[in-house]
Amino acid sequence: FKVATPYSLYVCPEGQNVTLTCRLLGPVDKGHDVTFYKTWYRSSRGEVQTCSERRPIRNLTFQDLHLHHGGHQAANTSHDLAQRHGLESASDHHGNFSITMRNLTLLDSGLYCCLVVEIRHHHSEHRVHGAMELQVQTGKDAPSNCVVYPSSSQDSENITAA
């Protein structure tokens, strides 16, 4: 499987909510001996590989925000901790995987990464990630609502797998 990022850039006004999205592509094993781990984190555009560094999102680590389930099951993050920070990550039956950030501030600007790991009994992890940029703007140049910019087909397939 691969991960696609439908949008590579989100430009939002301060105070707005945004939902960043990744999508699983390709066949997904739903066997009893396979589990999917999905999470979000902030990162930096490394010279060699984007999404290597894992920084917290609003003080929540990638482990705080992870989802853990089989196949295309739906899942949500544990509500208390994430929602106290204005965050919620979710996964649906169709391979869509998102994080919603409420009441954006300028400090939320940066590179965001989704990570999906297939964990299978006796096998090495299969890891894929996607990256997208969030720009939070203020003042007269800021849009009234979030504006999203689609990834080029090349970018949306440009995924790193171990």
Epitope: D33, T35, Y37, T39, G46, V48, Q49, S52, E53, R54, F62, Q63, H66, H68, L115, V117, I119, R120, H121, H122, H123, S124, E125, R127, T160, A162
Partner: antibody, heavy 119, light 107 residues
Framework: QLQLQESGPGLVKPSETLSLTCTVS??????????WGWIRQPPGKGLEWIGS???????YYNPSLKSRVTISVDTSKNQSSLKLNSVTTADTAVYYC???????????WGQGTLVTVSS | DIQMTQSPSSLSASVGDRVTITCRAS??????LAWYQQKPEKAPKSLIY???SLQSGVPSRFSGSGSGTDFTLTISSLQPEDFATYYC?????????FGQGTKLEIK
């Protein structure tokens, strides 16, 4: 803060089974998204990964030890255990338990326990 | 199995020196490489993950670089507490493997 503490006999006879326990405090061993691993280090030598157990119960072993090793967890005691059977003197080492998140390296380690295999 | 080869095996240096340790993987491991520091009678401590990302709480004089098969750990200005043994580890695939270690000694 997470703490890992290995315990078990410091001396095991050749051909017997080495049994060690790793007690976790400051966190739950059943937390999803983590592996609980064992690494060993013979005196004066380097590190060797023995195996890891994922929170779902999946196990991963070093092929060089796979026929002799079993890693399990007891969630009620918040413990991981290592069993290595048919030991020889080559199994003399400091044994560490360690935790690693999904798609990450070992970020938390116990202080290690020396096990000597000798008759 | 992926073999990890470190060089040099031992190294003498002085406080304030810049030191570089290299690690080579027998096959490509992307950026799935970690560096650890181990002092005598102590457990290893994680310094670097994902080849170049600093573990929380680790001083910024430590840095890592590389991708694929060739990696380096650099200490920009050696401090007295940095004299120890350093190990690289690949976590690209099972079985996870470590380099044989580099012992950093005081000159």
């Amino acid at each position: 803060q997470l703490q890992l503490q290995e315990s078990g006999p410091g001396l095991v006879k050749p051909s017997e089974t080495l049994s060690l326990t790793c007690t976790v405090s400051g966190g739950s061993i059943s937390s999803s998204g983590y592996y609980w691993g064992w690494i060993r280090q013979p005196p004066g030598k380097g590190l060797e990964w023995i195996g890891s157990l994922y929170s779902s119960g999946y196990t991963y072993y070093n092929p060089s030890l796979k026929s002799r090793v079993t890693i399990s967890v007891d969630t009620s005691k918040n413990q991981s255990s290592l069993k290595l059977n048919s030991v020889t003197t080559a199994d003399t080492a400091v044994y560490y338990c360690a935790r690693h998140p999904v798609a990450m390296n070992f970020d938390d380690w116990g202080q290690g326990t020396l096990v000597t295999v000798s008759s | 199995d992926i073999q990890m080869t470190q060089s040099p095996s031992s190294l003498s240096a002085s406080v304030g020196d810049r030191v570089t340790i290299t690690c080579r993987a027998s096959q490509g491991i992307s950026s799935w490489l970690a560096w650890y520091q181990q002092k005598p009678e102590k457990a290893p401590k994680s310094l670097i993950y994902a080849a170049s990302s600093l573990q929380s709480g680790v001083p910024s004089r430590f840095s890592g670089s590389g991708s694929g098969t060739d990696f380096t750990l650099t200490i920009s200005s050696l401090q007295p507490e940095d004299f120890a043994t350093y190990y690289c580890q690949q976590y690209n695939s099972y079985p996870y493997t470590f380099g044989q270690g580099t012992k950093l000694e005081i000159k």
